[in-house]
Protein backbone atom coordinates (compact mmCIF):
# COMPACT_ATOMS: atom_id res chain seq x y z
CA UNK A 1 0.00 0.00 0.00
CA UNK A 2 1.28 3.47 -0.82
CA UNK A 3 0.23 6.47 1.24
CA UNK A 4 0.17 9.94 -0.29
CA UNK A 5 -0.15 13.31 1.40
CA UNK A 6 0.24 16.90 0.31
CA UNK A 7 3.87 18.01 0.41
CA UNK A 8 2.88 21.60 1.16
CA UNK A 9 1.82 22.47 4.69
CA UNK A 10 -1.90 22.83 5.29
CA UNK A 11 -2.57 26.39 6.45
CA UNK A 12 -5.56 26.77 8.76
CA UNK A 13 -6.98 29.84 10.45
CA UNK A 14 -7.54 29.67 14.19
CA UNK A 15 -11.10 28.60 15.04
CA UNK A 16 -11.78 27.21 11.56
CA UNK A 17 -11.75 23.55 10.46
CA UNK A 18 -8.83 21.99 8.60
CA UNK A 19 -8.54 18.87 6.47
CA UNK A 20 -5.28 16.95 6.55
CA UNK A 21 -5.35 15.08 3.25
CA UNK A 22 -4.11 11.49 3.08
CA UNK A 23 -4.92 8.85 0.50
CA UNK A 24 -4.04 5.29 -0.48
CA UNK A 25 -4.87 3.12 -3.48
CA UNK A 26 -7.09 0.20 -2.48
CA UNK A 27 -6.63 -3.09 -4.33
CA UNK A 28 -9.64 -4.63 -6.11
CA UNK A 29 -11.84 -6.43 -3.57
CA UNK A 30 -10.63 -4.21 -0.72
CA UNK A 31 -12.96 -4.04 2.27
CA UNK A 32 -12.88 -1.80 5.33
CA UNK A 33 -12.42 -4.88 7.52
CA UNK A 34 -8.85 -5.02 6.20
CA UNK A 35 -8.08 -1.36 6.88
CA UNK A 36 -6.10 -0.11 9.83
CA UNK A 37 -5.66 3.66 9.79
CA UNK A 38 -3.82 5.57 12.47
CA UNK A 39 -3.30 9.32 12.67
CA UNK A 40 -0.80 10.48 15.25
CA UNK A 41 1.39 13.46 16.11
CA UNK A 42 4.67 12.77 14.36
CA UNK A 43 7.02 14.01 17.07
CA UNK A 44 5.36 12.75 20.24
CA UNK A 45 3.57 9.76 18.62
CA UNK A 46 0.42 10.79 20.48
CA UNK A 47 -2.62 9.05 18.99
CA UNK A 48 -5.00 11.46 17.27
CA UNK A 49 -7.56 9.22 15.56
CA UNK A 50 -7.80 5.59 14.49
CA UNK A 51 -9.84 3.20 12.40
CA UNK A 52 -9.06 -0.44 13.17
CA UNK A 53 -10.77 -3.80 13.12
CA UNK A 54 -13.36 -2.52 10.67
CA UNK A 55 -14.58 0.43 12.71
CA UNK A 56 -13.87 4.01 13.59
CA UNK A 57 -12.29 4.01 17.03
CA UNK A 58 -12.91 7.73 17.33
CA UNK A 59 -10.91 10.75 18.32
CA UNK A 60 -8.17 10.45 20.88
CA UNK A 61 -7.38 14.15 20.56
CA UNK A 62 -9.73 16.48 22.41
CA UNK A 63 -12.75 15.14 20.47
CA UNK A 64 -12.12 17.51 17.57
CA UNK A 65 -11.16 15.03 14.87
CA UNK A 66 -13.17 13.02 12.36
CA UNK A 67 -12.55 10.81 9.36
CA UNK A 68 -14.61 10.76 6.17
CA UNK A 69 -16.28 7.36 6.69
CA UNK A 70 -18.03 7.19 3.32
CA UNK A 71 -14.79 7.89 1.47
CA UNK A 72 -12.50 5.43 3.29
CA UNK A 73 -13.35 2.53 0.99
CA UNK A 74 -12.20 4.69 -1.96
CA UNK A 75 -8.84 5.24 -0.29
CA UNK A 76 -9.52 8.64 1.26
CA UNK A 77 -7.94 8.54 4.73
CA UNK A 78 -8.08 12.30 5.32
CA UNK A 79 -8.56 13.73 8.79
CA UNK A 80 -10.83 16.64 9.66
CA UNK A 81 -9.62 18.77 12.56
CA UNK A 82 -12.28 21.07 13.97
CA UNK A 83 -11.88 24.48 15.62
CA UNK A 84 -8.15 24.67 15.03
CA UNK A 85 -6.00 25.97 17.86
CA UNK A 86 -2.45 27.27 17.90
CA UNK A 87 -1.42 24.17 19.85
CA UNK A 88 -2.56 21.96 16.94
CA UNK A 89 0.32 23.20 14.80
CA UNK A 90 2.85 20.56 13.80
CA UNK A 91 3.35 17.38 11.85
CA UNK A 92 0.76 14.60 11.66
CA UNK A 93 1.51 11.06 10.50
CA UNK A 94 -1.03 9.12 8.47
CA UNK A 95 -0.34 5.38 8.85
CA UNK A 96 -2.23 2.87 6.72
CA UNK A 97 -1.96 -0.88 7.18
CA UNK A 98 -3.75 -3.35 4.92
CA UNK A 99 -1.68 -6.24 3.57
CA UNK A 100 1.47 -4.28 4.28
CA UNK A 101 1.79 -0.73 5.56
CA UNK A 102 3.01 2.72 4.66
CA UNK A 103 2.92 6.14 6.25
CA UNK A 104 3.50 9.77 5.40
CA UNK A 105 3.54 13.02 7.35
CA UNK A 106 1.61 16.20 6.65
CA UNK A 107 2.31 19.56 8.30
CA UNK A 108 -0.34 21.81 9.75
CA UNK A 109 0.53 25.50 9.90
CA UNK A 110 -1.83 27.55 12.06
CA UNK A 111 -2.41 31.24 11.35
CA UNK A 112 -4.49 34.16 12.59
CA UNK A 113 -4.66 37.62 10.95
CA UNK A 114 -3.43 40.65 12.87
CA UNK A 115 -5.83 43.48 13.69
CA UNK A 116 -5.47 46.92 12.12
CA UNK A 117 -2.72 48.61 14.16
CA UNK A 118 -3.61 51.33 16.61
CA UNK A 119 -1.14 54.22 16.88
CA UNK A 120 -0.29 56.21 20.00
CA UNK A 121 2.04 59.12 20.48
CA UNK A 122 3.97 60.17 23.57
CA UNK A 123 3.95 63.06 24.29
CA UNK A 124 0.80 63.80 22.31
CA UNK A 125 0.58 67.59 22.71
CA UNK A 126 2.74 70.70 22.44
CA UNK A 127 4.88 68.99 19.81
CA UNK A 128 7.62 71.07 18.16
CA UNK A 129 10.08 70.21 15.42
CA UNK A 130 13.19 68.79 17.06
CA UNK A 131 11.22 67.09 19.84
CA UNK A 132 11.88 63.44 20.54
CA UNK A 133 8.61 61.47 20.35
CA UNK A 134 7.69 57.87 20.96
CA UNK A 135 5.23 56.36 18.48
CA UNK A 136 3.71 53.02 19.46
CA UNK A 137 2.08 50.72 16.94
CA UNK A 138 -0.07 47.96 18.47
CA UNK A 139 -1.71 45.04 16.67
CA UNK A 140 -3.52 42.14 18.30
CA UNK A 141 -4.46 38.48 18.18
CA UNK A 142 -2.28 37.27 15.33
CA UNK A 143 -0.27 34.12 14.68
CA UNK A 144 2.52 33.35 14.07
CA UNK A 145 4.81 36.14 15.26
CA UNK A 146 4.62 39.22 13.06
CA UNK A 147 7.23 41.10 11.09
CA UNK A 148 7.03 44.86 11.76
CA UNK A 149 8.29 47.56 9.39
CA UNK A 150 8.36 51.34 9.91
CA UNK A 151 8.53 53.94 7.13
CA UNK A 152 8.48 57.69 6.91
CA UNK A 153 6.25 59.78 4.63
CA UNK A 154 8.57 59.26 1.69
CA UNK A 155 8.51 55.47 2.14
CA UNK A 156 12.04 55.35 3.53
CA UNK A 157 12.47 52.51 6.02
CA UNK A 158 13.09 53.54 9.61
CA UNK A 159 15.17 50.92 11.35
CA UNK A 160 17.03 52.76 14.09
CA UNK A 161 15.47 53.21 17.52
CA UNK A 162 12.75 50.62 16.95
CA UNK A 163 11.85 48.21 19.74
CA UNK A 164 9.32 45.47 19.03
CA UNK A 165 7.85 43.11 21.59
CA UNK A 166 5.45 40.24 21.00
CA UNK A 167 3.55 38.58 23.80
CA UNK A 168 1.45 35.43 23.45
CA UNK A 169 -1.88 35.35 25.24
CA UNK A 170 -3.51 32.28 26.80
CA UNK A 171 -4.67 31.07 23.36
CA UNK A 172 -1.16 31.38 21.95
CA UNK A 173 -2.05 34.41 19.80
CA UNK A 174 0.40 37.29 19.71
CA UNK A 175 -0.13 40.93 20.61
CA UNK A 176 2.55 43.09 18.94
CA UNK A 177 3.79 46.39 20.29
CA UNK A 178 6.39 48.21 18.26
CA UNK A 179 7.89 51.46 19.51
CA UNK A 180 9.62 54.00 17.26
CA UNK A 181 11.62 56.82 18.88
CA UNK A 182 12.07 59.64 16.41
CA UNK A 183 13.04 63.36 16.30
CA UNK A 184 10.19 65.33 14.76
CA UNK A 185 10.70 67.23 11.53
CA UNK A 186 8.54 70.21 10.48
CA UNK A 187 5.78 67.74 9.70
CA UNK A 188 5.71 64.11 8.70
CA UNK A 189 3.94 60.82 8.40
CA UNK A 190 5.10 57.70 10.18
CA UNK A 191 3.58 54.39 9.19
CA UNK A 192 3.92 50.93 10.60
CA UNK A 193 3.21 47.72 8.73
CA UNK A 194 2.46 44.51 10.63
CA UNK A 195 2.93 41.47 8.40
CA UNK A 196 1.72 37.94 9.02
CA UNK A 197 4.45 35.88 7.32
CA UNK A 198 2.23 32.84 6.76
CA UNK A 199 -0.87 34.58 5.46
CA UNK A 200 1.18 37.28 3.68
CA UNK A 201 -1.33 39.66 5.24
CA UNK A 202 -0.28 43.27 5.85
CA UNK A 203 -2.00 45.47 8.43
CA UNK A 204 -1.19 49.18 8.17
CA UNK A 205 -1.29 52.02 10.66
CA UNK A 206 0.02 55.57 10.35
CA UNK A 207 0.22 58.85 12.15
CA UNK A 208 0.68 62.23 10.50
CA UNK A 209 2.13 65.14 12.46
CA UNK A 210 1.35 68.56 10.96
CA UNK A 211 1.79 70.82 13.92
CA UNK A 212 -1.68 70.61 15.51
CA UNK A 213 -3.98 68.68 15.42
CA UNK A 214 -2.55 65.20 14.91
CA UNK A 215 -4.18 62.77 12.49
CA UNK A 216 -4.13 59.02 12.95
Amino acid sequence: VEVQVSEDPVVALVDTDATLRCSFSPEPGFSLAQLNLIWQLTDTKQLVHSFTEGRDQGSAYSNRTALFPDLLVQGNASLRLQRVRVTDEGSYTCFVSIQDFDSAAVSLQVAAPYSKPSMTLEPNKDLRPGNMVTITCSSYQGYPEAEVFWKDGQGVPLTGNVTTSQMANERGLFDVHSVLRVVLGANGTYSCLVRNPVLQQDAHGSVTITGQPLTF
Epitope: Q34, N36, Q40
Partner: antibody, heavy 118, light 109 residues
Protein backbone atom coordinates in the same frame (compact mmCIF):
# COMPACT_ATOMS: atom_id res chain seq x y z
CA UNK B 1 22.18 -2.97 1.53
CA UNK B 2 20.16 -3.63 4.68
CA UNK B 3 22.06 -5.04 7.64
CA UNK B 4 20.96 -5.92 11.15
CA UNK B 5 23.76 -6.28 13.66
CA UNK B 6 22.91 -7.73 17.07
CA UNK B 7 24.75 -7.49 20.37
CA UNK B 8 26.94 -10.36 21.56
CA UNK B 9 26.19 -13.58 23.44
CA UNK B 10 25.07 -13.33 27.07
CA UNK B 11 25.17 -15.68 30.04
CA UNK B 12 22.56 -14.84 32.67
CA UNK B 13 21.42 -16.11 36.03
CA UNK B 14 17.82 -17.28 36.55
CA UNK B 15 15.59 -14.42 37.69
CA UNK B 16 17.72 -11.75 36.02
CA UNK B 17 17.03 -9.76 32.81
CA UNK B 18 18.73 -9.56 29.44
CA UNK B 19 18.62 -6.72 26.91
CA UNK B 20 19.58 -7.51 23.32
CA UNK B 21 20.18 -4.75 20.79
CA UNK B 22 19.73 -4.76 17.02
CA UNK B 23 21.29 -1.95 14.98
CA UNK B 24 19.92 -1.42 11.50
CA UNK B 25 21.70 0.15 8.57
CA UNK B 26 20.33 0.73 5.07
CA UNK B 27 16.78 1.91 4.44
CA UNK B 28 14.71 4.15 6.67
CA UNK B 29 14.63 2.60 10.13
CA UNK B 30 11.28 4.08 11.18
CA UNK B 31 9.40 2.83 8.14
CA UNK B 32 9.69 -0.90 8.79
CA UNK B 33 8.34 -3.31 11.36
CA UNK B 34 10.94 -5.04 13.51
CA UNK B 35 10.21 -8.49 14.95
CA UNK B 36 11.97 -10.47 17.61
CA UNK B 37 12.02 -14.24 17.15
CA UNK B 38 13.71 -16.83 19.32
CA UNK B 39 14.79 -20.41 18.78
CA UNK B 40 15.62 -22.76 21.62
CA UNK B 41 18.20 -25.49 20.90
CA UNK B 42 16.68 -28.07 18.51
CA UNK B 43 13.30 -26.29 18.57
CA UNK B 44 11.22 -24.26 16.14
CA UNK B 45 10.84 -20.52 15.68
CA UNK B 46 8.87 -18.54 18.24
CA UNK B 47 7.67 -14.97 17.59
CA UNK B 48 8.03 -12.90 20.74
CA UNK B 49 6.87 -9.49 19.65
CA UNK B 50 7.52 -6.59 17.35
CA UNK B 51 7.52 -2.84 16.99
CA UNK B 52 6.68 -0.33 14.28
CA UNK B 53 9.14 2.48 15.10
CA UNK B 54 7.22 5.20 13.27
CA UNK B 55 4.20 4.52 15.50
CA UNK B 56 6.16 3.67 18.61
CA UNK B 57 3.71 0.83 19.14
CA UNK B 58 5.00 -2.56 20.33
CA UNK B 59 2.96 -5.75 20.29
CA UNK B 60 3.77 -8.95 22.14
CA UNK B 61 2.89 -12.62 21.89
CA UNK B 62 0.55 -13.64 24.70
CA UNK B 63 3.15 -16.03 26.08
CA UNK B 64 5.63 -13.21 26.71
CA UNK B 65 3.22 -10.45 27.74
CA UNK B 66 4.48 -8.72 30.87
CA UNK B 67 7.94 -10.26 30.60
CA UNK B 68 9.22 -8.76 27.38
CA UNK B 69 9.70 -5.10 26.43
CA UNK B 70 10.54 -4.07 22.88
CA UNK B 71 11.67 -0.52 22.17
CA UNK B 72 13.19 1.40 19.28
CA UNK B 73 15.55 4.35 19.27
CA UNK B 74 15.01 6.15 15.97
CA UNK B 75 18.02 8.43 16.51
CA UNK B 76 20.43 5.47 16.47
CA UNK B 77 18.35 3.10 14.28
CA UNK B 78 18.48 0.52 17.05
CA UNK B 79 15.79 -1.80 18.38
CA UNK B 80 15.97 -3.45 21.78
CA UNK B 81 14.38 -6.53 23.31
CA UNK B 82 14.45 -6.91 27.07
CA UNK B 83 13.34 -10.18 28.66
CA UNK B 84 12.95 -10.31 32.43
CA UNK B 85 12.54 -13.05 35.05
CA UNK B 86 14.78 -15.35 33.06
CA UNK B 87 14.55 -19.11 33.49
CA UNK B 88 16.53 -21.97 31.97
CA UNK B 89 13.86 -22.48 29.25
CA UNK B 90 14.74 -19.01 27.93
CA UNK B 91 18.10 -20.33 26.73
CA UNK B 92 17.86 -19.71 23.00
CA UNK B 93 19.16 -17.81 20.00
CA UNK B 94 17.31 -14.49 19.76
CA UNK B 95 16.90 -12.93 16.31
CA UNK B 96 15.73 -9.52 15.21
CA UNK B 97 14.22 -9.26 11.73
CA UNK B 98 12.70 -6.64 9.49
CA UNK B 99 11.05 -6.36 6.11
CA UNK B 100 11.53 -4.63 2.79
CA UNK B 101 8.06 -3.23 3.15
CA UNK B 102 5.35 -3.91 5.63
CA UNK B 103 5.57 -6.79 8.02
CA UNK B 104 7.43 -9.69 6.42
CA UNK B 105 10.96 -10.38 7.55
CA UNK B 106 13.36 -10.34 4.61
CA UNK B 107 16.36 -9.37 6.71
CA UNK B 108 17.58 -11.06 9.86
CA UNK B 109 20.26 -10.31 12.41
CA UNK B 110 23.02 -12.83 13.03
CA UNK B 111 21.32 -14.00 16.22
CA UNK B 112 22.30 -13.58 19.85
CA UNK B 113 22.74 -16.64 22.04
CA UNK B 114 21.37 -16.10 25.54
CA UNK B 115 22.25 -18.82 28.04
CA UNK B 116 20.39 -18.91 31.33
CA UNK B 117 22.25 -20.98 33.89
CA UNK B 118 22.66 -21.03 37.64
CA UNK C 1 -4.72 -16.97 19.59
CA UNK C 2 -4.42 -18.54 16.14
CA UNK C 3 -2.63 -21.89 16.01
CA UNK C 4 -0.85 -23.13 12.89
CA UNK C 5 -0.46 -26.83 12.13
CA UNK C 6 2.07 -28.03 9.55
CA UNK C 7 2.08 -31.38 7.83
CA UNK C 8 3.84 -33.60 7.38
CA UNK C 9 6.37 -33.12 10.19
CA UNK C 10 9.03 -34.67 7.95
CA UNK C 11 9.07 -35.11 4.20
CA UNK C 12 11.67 -37.46 2.70
CA UNK C 13 12.15 -36.89 -1.02
CA UNK C 14 14.79 -37.34 -3.69
CA UNK C 15 16.31 -34.46 -5.69
CA UNK C 16 14.11 -33.56 -8.66
CA UNK C 17 10.91 -34.62 -6.88
CA UNK C 18 8.02 -32.30 -6.14
CA UNK C 19 7.52 -31.27 -2.51
CA UNK C 20 4.11 -30.24 -1.19
CA UNK C 21 4.00 -28.76 2.32
CA UNK C 22 0.77 -27.93 4.09
CA UNK C 23 -0.07 -25.30 6.69
CA UNK C 24 -3.46 -25.08 8.35
CA UNK C 25 -4.70 -22.21 10.57
CA UNK C 26 -7.17 -22.69 13.43
CA UNK C 27 -9.16 -19.75 12.05
CA UNK C 28 -9.08 -17.62 8.92
CA UNK C 29 -5.94 -15.54 8.39
CA UNK C 30 -7.06 -14.22 4.99
CA UNK C 31 -3.84 -14.20 2.97
CA UNK C 32 -1.65 -12.94 5.82
CA UNK C 33 0.67 -15.95 5.59
CA UNK C 34 4.40 -16.26 4.90
CA UNK C 35 6.77 -19.20 4.41
CA UNK C 36 10.38 -19.31 5.68
CA UNK C 37 13.24 -21.69 5.03
CA UNK C 38 15.86 -22.40 7.68
CA UNK C 39 19.07 -24.38 7.37
CA UNK C 40 21.10 -25.56 10.40
CA UNK C 41 23.09 -22.76 12.04
CA UNK C 42 21.51 -20.08 9.84
CA UNK C 43 18.84 -17.44 10.29
CA UNK C 44 15.51 -18.07 8.55
CA UNK C 45 15.01 -16.85 4.99
CA UNK C 46 11.73 -15.44 3.67
CA UNK C 47 10.42 -17.39 0.67
CA UNK C 48 6.77 -16.39 0.24
CA UNK C 49 4.72 -13.53 1.64
CA UNK C 50 0.99 -12.77 1.44
CA UNK C 51 0.40 -16.48 0.77
CA UNK C 52 1.52 -16.47 -2.85
CA UNK C 53 4.12 -13.76 -3.54
CA UNK C 54 7.73 -14.81 -3.96
CA UNK C 55 10.24 -12.74 -2.01
CA UNK C 56 13.10 -11.03 -3.81
CA UNK C 57 15.69 -13.48 -5.17
CA UNK C 58 13.64 -16.62 -4.51
CA UNK C 59 13.75 -19.15 -7.39
CA UNK C 60 10.57 -19.80 -9.39
CA UNK C 61 10.44 -23.44 -8.23
CA UNK C 62 9.03 -22.15 -4.94
CA UNK C 63 5.34 -21.24 -5.04
CA UNK C 64 2.66 -20.59 -2.44
CA UNK C 65 -1.09 -20.87 -2.61
CA UNK C 66 -4.17 -20.79 -0.42
CA UNK C 67 -6.24 -18.37 1.63
CA UNK C 68 -8.36 -18.48 4.75
CA UNK C 69 -7.24 -21.54 6.69
CA UNK C 70 -5.46 -23.82 4.19
CA UNK C 71 -2.13 -23.01 2.60
CA UNK C 72 0.42 -24.89 0.52
CA UNK C 73 4.09 -24.38 -0.25
CA UNK C 74 5.21 -26.25 -3.37
CA UNK C 75 8.78 -26.87 -4.49
CA UNK C 76 8.33 -28.04 -8.07
CA UNK C 77 11.66 -29.87 -8.36
CA UNK C 78 13.88 -30.29 -5.32
CA UNK C 79 17.46 -29.05 -5.56
CA UNK C 80 20.16 -30.23 -3.13
CA UNK C 81 20.13 -26.79 -1.42
CA UNK C 82 16.40 -27.05 -0.69
CA UNK C 83 16.82 -29.61 2.12
CA UNK C 84 15.92 -27.60 5.20
CA UNK C 85 13.14 -26.90 7.67
CA UNK C 86 10.18 -24.87 6.37
CA UNK C 87 8.00 -22.74 8.65
CA UNK C 88 4.72 -21.02 7.90
CA UNK C 89 3.91 -17.81 9.77
CA UNK C 90 0.61 -15.97 10.07
CA UNK C 91 -0.19 -12.40 11.03
CA UNK C 92 -3.37 -11.13 12.62
CA UNK C 93 -4.87 -8.06 10.97
CA UNK C 94 -4.65 -5.66 13.93
CA UNK C 95 -2.77 -5.49 16.14
CA UNK C 96 -0.09 -7.22 14.05
CA UNK C 97 0.59 -10.37 16.06
CA UNK C 98 2.41 -13.34 14.51
CA UNK C 99 2.70 -17.06 15.12
CA UNK C 100 4.88 -19.69 13.49
CA UNK C 101 3.90 -23.21 12.66
CA UNK C 102 5.98 -26.08 14.14
CA UNK C 103 7.87 -26.61 10.88
CA UNK C 104 8.23 -29.30 8.23
CA UNK C 105 11.65 -30.89 7.73
CA UNK C 106 12.46 -31.78 4.14
CA UNK C 107 15.25 -34.32 4.04
CA UNK C 108 16.94 -36.50 1.45
CA UNK C 109 15.35 -39.87 0.81
Amino acid sequence: QVQLVQSGAEVKKPGSSVKVSCKASGGTFSSYAISWVRQAPGQGLEWMGGIIPILGIANYAQKFQGRVTITADESTSTAYMELSSLRSEDTAVYYCARGDSGYDSNYWGQGTLVTVSA
Amino acid sequence: EIVLTQSPATLSLSPGERATLSCRASQSVSTYLAWYQQKPGQAPRLLIYDASNRATGIPARFSGSGSGTDFTLTISSLEPEDYAVYYCQQRSNWPPLFTFGPGTKVDIK
